[in-house]
Amino acid sequence: EPPTACREKQYLINSQCCSLCQPGQKLVSDCTEFTETECLPCSESEFLDTWNRETRCHQHKYCDPNLGLQVQQKGTSETDTICTCEEGLHCTSESCESCVPHRSCLPGFGVKQIATGVSDTICEPCPVGFFSNVSSAFEKCRPWTSCETKDLVVQQAGTNKTDVVCGPQDRQRA
C-alpha cells in the first residue's frame, strides 16, 4: 500500500517517499522506484537554507550601501547574506532591508538603551532629581547638581530639562 505520510527529511510524490535535498542543494529530479532524488549544489551567490525540494536556489541578499546597509556576514550555499546598518543607523525591519537614523531623545528625556545596527534608541523621561537639556542619541539623564556638597543652596529648582541653580547661602539669618 502506498504511503500517505513520509519520514522527516522526505516528501511524498507519486505515492512514494523521496529524500529532500539538503541545505545548499536544489532539486533536479524526484526519486523513482529505482533511483534516488537527484540534487545539485547551489552556485556561488546563491543559497538554500533548509532541507527542501526547491528547483531554484535563492539569490544572496545584496546589502545596498545606498540604503545604509553593510554586510554583517557573507552568505554561503546554506545561508543568506546578513545585512546590518552603518553606524548611526538601524534596520527598519527584522529582515533589515533598509536603514534609518537613530532617534535622539529630546530634552527632558534620556537614553535608556543606546541604539544598535538592528534596534533604535530607547528613551525614558528623566525622573525627579534628573534632567537632560540636550537632544541626544547617547546622553542619559544626569542628576541635578547637589548644592549642599558645594556648601551652596538651591536658588532655582531643577526640572526634567534644567539643572538646579546653586548660590551662596543667605548670611542674614533670622
Epitope: V28, L40, P41, S45, R56, C57, Q59, K61, V71
Partner: antibody, heavy 118, light 106 residues
Amino acid sequence: QVQLVQSGAEVKKPGASVKVSCTASGFNIKDYYVHWVKQAPGQGLEWMGRIDPEDGDSKYAPKFQGKATMTADTSTSTVYMELSSLRSEDTAVYYCTTSYYVGTYGYWGQGTLVTVSS
Amino acid sequence: DIQMTQSPSSLSASVGDRVTITCSASSSVSYMLWFQQKPGKAPKLLIYSTSNLASGVPSRFSGSGSGTDFTLTISSLQPEDFATYYCQQRTFYPYTFGGGTKVEIK
C-alpha cells in the same frame, strides 16, 4: 567611484616571480569573493582560483595550484596574486573580478598584462 | 573538472539576425553565467542564474537551459553586440569557462 584597480603591466624573465595587485575602491572587498582569470594572447578566459578576503580561504584550479598564490590585505582593500617560476606560457592578461550580487553584478579590474621574455 | 564546450567557436551574422550560442557541460550544473567581452576590455556579466539579465543588459539577450545544456540567444543582433561571448559554471570547483564564441560581422 566603485571599481577594482589593478597594478600596471610587468615584464619578467623566465624563472622570476610577479605579484599583481587588485584594489577595491567605493565598496568593501570583504563583502565579496575575488576571482582571478587568465587570458593568454588571442585565447579565451581561464579561471585560476578565488579568495575570500575576509579569512584568506582560497580555492585553486588544479592547473594553477603551486603556480599562483592568492592573498588579501583587508586594511588596504587589496588582494594579490603571485605567480612563481614564470615561463613564456604565463604571458597573459590577468583579471581580478568579484562574485556578484543582484545589485552589483560583479566588478572587474582593467587587467594586468604580464609578459615573460628572456 | 567540469568541461564546458561552447559552440560555435565563431560565427558571422548580420545586424538584425537571431543568434544562438550553446554551452554544454560535461556534468550537470545548477546554473550558467554568460559574459560578453570586447577587444581590449574586461568581460561583462550579461546573464546570471541561467536566465536572469544583469542590470542594463538589453532585453534582446536571453538565456535558457538546465542540467548540461544551456543557450544564449540574441533575438536581433545590433552593431554593439559584435564581441566574444563566454559561458561559465560556478557550481563546482574548479569553476570553468567555455572556450568562447566570437560573433563577427558578415
